[in-house]
Amino acid sequence: LTVETTQDILRAARGRSVTLPCTYNTYVSDREGFIQWDKLLRSQTERVVTWNFVTKKYIYGNRYENRVRVSNDAELSNASITIDQLTMDDNGTYECSVSLMSDQDVNAKSRVRLLVLVPPSKPDCSIQGEMVIGNNIQLTCHSAEGSPSPQYSWKSYNAQNQQRPLTQPVSGEPLLLKNISTETAGYYICTSSNDVGIESCNITVAPRPPSMNI
């Protein structure tokens, strides 16, 4: 008995369905046993589904009730499953196992990694620090959602709406602006992007003079 998954990594959008491929080969014609899928986590194994060749009965892990189904060709060497209504919690590595009681080896397994794709949510832009001439401030940008994890990049425009270079790398967050001055004034756009989408937010920077105590 041998089992293989035809792809190492699968990508599918949140809310959609995905078929996790798994095929098996055996020299026996009798199909008495089980197809099982588990999700392999860092601290535990989570049962996804167990399917009985004889009774055709499904046993689901709690998160998978009625949204996982085994291939119609399960008895013809196809142990693939389809997972519906994908969520971010479905990200991870899955293991397909086929157990046939009449096969000498009984048990065989293979793995596939599922990456659930989610476009970045509109990022939150914020300023850390006091917007006073001479101070250092930090511009932060973060999307609450996004899979794969979003990449962040910054662009800067002056009051005349002309793009200007940034003195530090434009990728990543946060953006540190040192010793701000009237030259720093303008607006800053953060772009959050991944394989499936792009979103942005902007911040206006208007440094004010320090208050004078007489």
Partner: antibody
């Protein structure tokens, strides 16, 4: 015949170390996840640790985390449990067990006794 | 961690009796519940897996049922060789065992 045979048990002082072995035969060892389960004298069964067929996924019970290390050598059809910083409460018969359908332990060894005492 | 509570912790029965042991999980474990028999000085032996599947070579007088949190092991007609301790085990989320039920001769 499908068989698991444990060895390496014995008497050890608190704070000491011991390495248990489990020799598998009669099945394709590299196809199965393997486990250690223990049973203190007169008590019930307690799962200790699990290792996937290729050693990628390893799990431990909270009671042994950081002290015990499970490993396997598929070329030698062998499973191991390295036990460090042993305590009196680790005294038990230690069984190795094969993980079958849906996580059930379908084949067990005969067990090896570990006694931690000064 | 998921906890399993077996009841009763011990029972006395006669040969031919119908014996029922229950196991309750602290949260839903679907049908990922297994039953083992252990005799003194011996290793446990798998009887039932995924709640109701009979392990190869186990007599048909043993049966299991249940799903979610409540499970039952039934011995339809107790035989002399069935006097032993029985353990339930969940395999849904790592593994935990029940505390055991000792079946003694009345």
């Amino acid at each position: 015949e499908v068989q698991l045979v444990e060895s390496g048990g014995g008497l050890v002082k608190p704070g000491g170390s011991l390495r248990l072995s489990c020799a598998a035969s009669g099945f394709t060892f590299s196809s199965y996840s393997m486990n250690w389960v223990r049973q203190a004298p007169g008590k019930g069964l307690e799962w200790v640790s699990s290792i996937s067929r290729d050693s990628t996924y390893i799990y431990y019970a909270d009671s042994v985390k950081g002290r015990f290390t499970i490993s396997r050598d598929n070329a030698k059809n062998s499973l191991y449990l390295q036990m460090n910083s042993l305590r009196a409460e680790d005294t038990a018969v230690y069984y190795c067990a094969r993980e079958g359908v849906a996580g059930a332990f379908d084949i067990w060894g005969q067990g090896t006794m570990v006694t931690v005492s000064s | 961690a998921i906890q399993l509570t077996q009841s009763p912790s011990s029972l006395s029965a006669s040969v031919g009796d119908r014996v029922t042991i229950t196991c309750r999980a602290s949260q839903s474990i679907s049908s990922y519940l297994n039953w083992y028999q252990q005799k003194p000085g011996k290793a446990p032996k798998l009887l039932i897996y995924i709640a109701s599947s009979l392990q190869s070579g186990v007599p048909s007088r043993f049966s299991g049922s249940g799903s979610g949190t409540d499970f039952t092991l039934t011995i339809s007609s107790l035989q002399p060789e069935d006097f032993a301790t029985y353990y339930c085990q969940q395999s849904y989320n790592t593994w935990t065992f029940g505390q055991g039920t000792k079946v003694e001769i009345k």
